[in-house]
């Protein structure tokens, strides 16, 4: 029986009950490797989920996450609700990022700004909740007798400590 | 979206041989079973059995075994049903359907096959 | 062969009215895997069959909610709340858990 099993192919399952071998895996159902037993119960993309690739009778389906929502790990598992760029997602809902820090995407946590001073660079640019600040020249290239074609950084908004 | 298209009419002489095309369009072709329907006045609904064009697989209603044989080009994704020994019991109208939620989730529009001297 | 049993043959409806088909299955037709693969189709003169009901009680995309399915073991039922002039048509049960897969007689429903 198990040499018969094996000439299964996908799609299929190794009926014992019936003489007549593979039988066709039922609807909502499916087996993507030959010689199987059972078969799989689809995925059903539900709720969050929508469906990014219908179930087959040979391969799962496969989902993604409506509208203001992202997967998260493997296979989509997880639907996260996405905030505003400037924003961070908590237990409590969205939260803006605090200050000296920024988030560029809907998904994902704040982090802070790049501290330019450790690279030896001035802020060019200063940032914001939704972008990173953007570093310069050092100050030293900056100083009387420099030869620089960057035109000096602008002065800083009050407030805004130096990175 | 799913579509099966299944060709013309035929009108077959008893003891000749008829094969009937079904063309699926929308979905990938080889990963569904194809199921096959035979629709009689009087008679009601007959299923005849199936194939899974990816790998050739098919199954028979026992009733319909000898009578039917089902191939399948998967380049063309077309599915073939050809019926033999025709007589006036095999007049009827054949339908192709492809399994999903169910097992007959979407239907060909038929193809009327009658047998006649 | 599992003999699908399809009552009435015939039911004439005014529209508005409820309308409901019963099913009986010679046998058990729950399938290896757990599932009872009761089906329902439509099939209106001159069209092929559509499915309205899969799995007992499920109502395929598109299918309004006054069509709704419900039974177990043997005994299965289709309600149709309140007829309209698209529903006229025969009916047809359908069972896919054991081989030969068959179908019922049909229904024919149809105004009064």
């Known amino acids: 029986l198990q040499d018969l099993c094996s000439n299964c192919p996908a799609g299929t399952f190794c009926d014992n009950n019936r003489s007549q071998i593979c039988s066709p895996c039922p609807p909502n159902s499916f087996s993507s490797a030959g010689g199987q037993r059972t078969c799989d119960i689809c995925r059903q993309c539900k709720g969050v989920f929508k469906t990014r690739k219908e179930c087959s009778s040979t391969s799962n389906a496969e989902c993604d996450c409506i509208s203001g929502y992202h997967c998260l790990g493997a296979e989509c598992s997880m639907c996260e609700q996405d905030c505003k760029q400037g924003q961070e997602l908590t237990k409590k809902g969205c939260k803006d990022c605090c200050f000296g820090t920024f988030n560029d995407q809907k998904r994902g946590i704040c982090r802070p700004w790049t501290n330019c001073s450790l690279d030896g660079k001035s802020v060019l640019v200063n940032g914001t909740k939704e972008r990173d600040v953007v570093c310069g020249p050092s100050p030293a290239d900056l100083s009387p007798g420099a030869s620089s074609a960057t035109p000096p950084a602008p002065a800083r908004e009050p407030g805004h400590s130096p990175q | 979206q799913v579509q099966l298209q299944q060709s013309g009419a035929e009108l077959m002489k008893p003891g000749a041989s008829v094969k009937i095309s079904c063309k699926a369009t929308?979905?990938?072709?080889?990963?569904?079973?194809l199921e096959w329907i035979k629709q009689r006045p009087g008679h009601g609904l007959e299923w005849i059995g199936e194939?899974?064009?990816?790998?050739?697989?098919?199954n028979y209603n026992e009733k319909f075994k000898g009578k039917a044989t089902f191939t399948a080009n998967t380049s063309s994704n077309t599915a073939y049903m050809q019926l033999s020994s025709l007589t006036s019991e095999d007049s009827a109208v054949y339908y192709c359907?492809?399994?999903?939620?169910?097992?007959?989730?979407?239907w060909g529009q038929g193809t009327l096959v009658t047998v006649s001297a | 062969d599992v003999l699908m049993t399809q009552t009435p043959l015939s039911l004439p409806v005014s529209l508005g009215d409820q309308a409901s088909i019963s099913c009986r299955s010679s046998q058990n037709i729950v399938h290896g895997n757990g599932n009872t693969y009761l089906e329902w189709y439509l099939q209106k003169p001159g069209q092929s069959p559509k499915l309205l009901i899969y799995?007992?009680?499920n109502r395929f995309s598109g299918v309004p909610d006054r069509f709704s399915g419900s039974g177990s073991g043997t005994d299965f039922t289709l309600k149709i709340s309140r007829v309209e002039a698209e529903d006229l048509g025969v009916y047809y049960c359908?069972?896919?858990?054991?081989?030969?897969?068959?179908f019922g007689g049909g229904t024919k429903l149809e105004i009064k």
């Open positions: 799995q007992v009680s």
């Open positions: 359908f069972q896919g858990s054991h081989v030969p897969r068959t």
């Open positions: 929308g979905y990938t072709f080889s990963s569904y079973w």
């Open positions: 194939i899974l064009p990816g790998s050739g697989v098919s």
């Open positions: 359907a492809r399994l999903g939620l169910a097992w007959f989730a979407y």
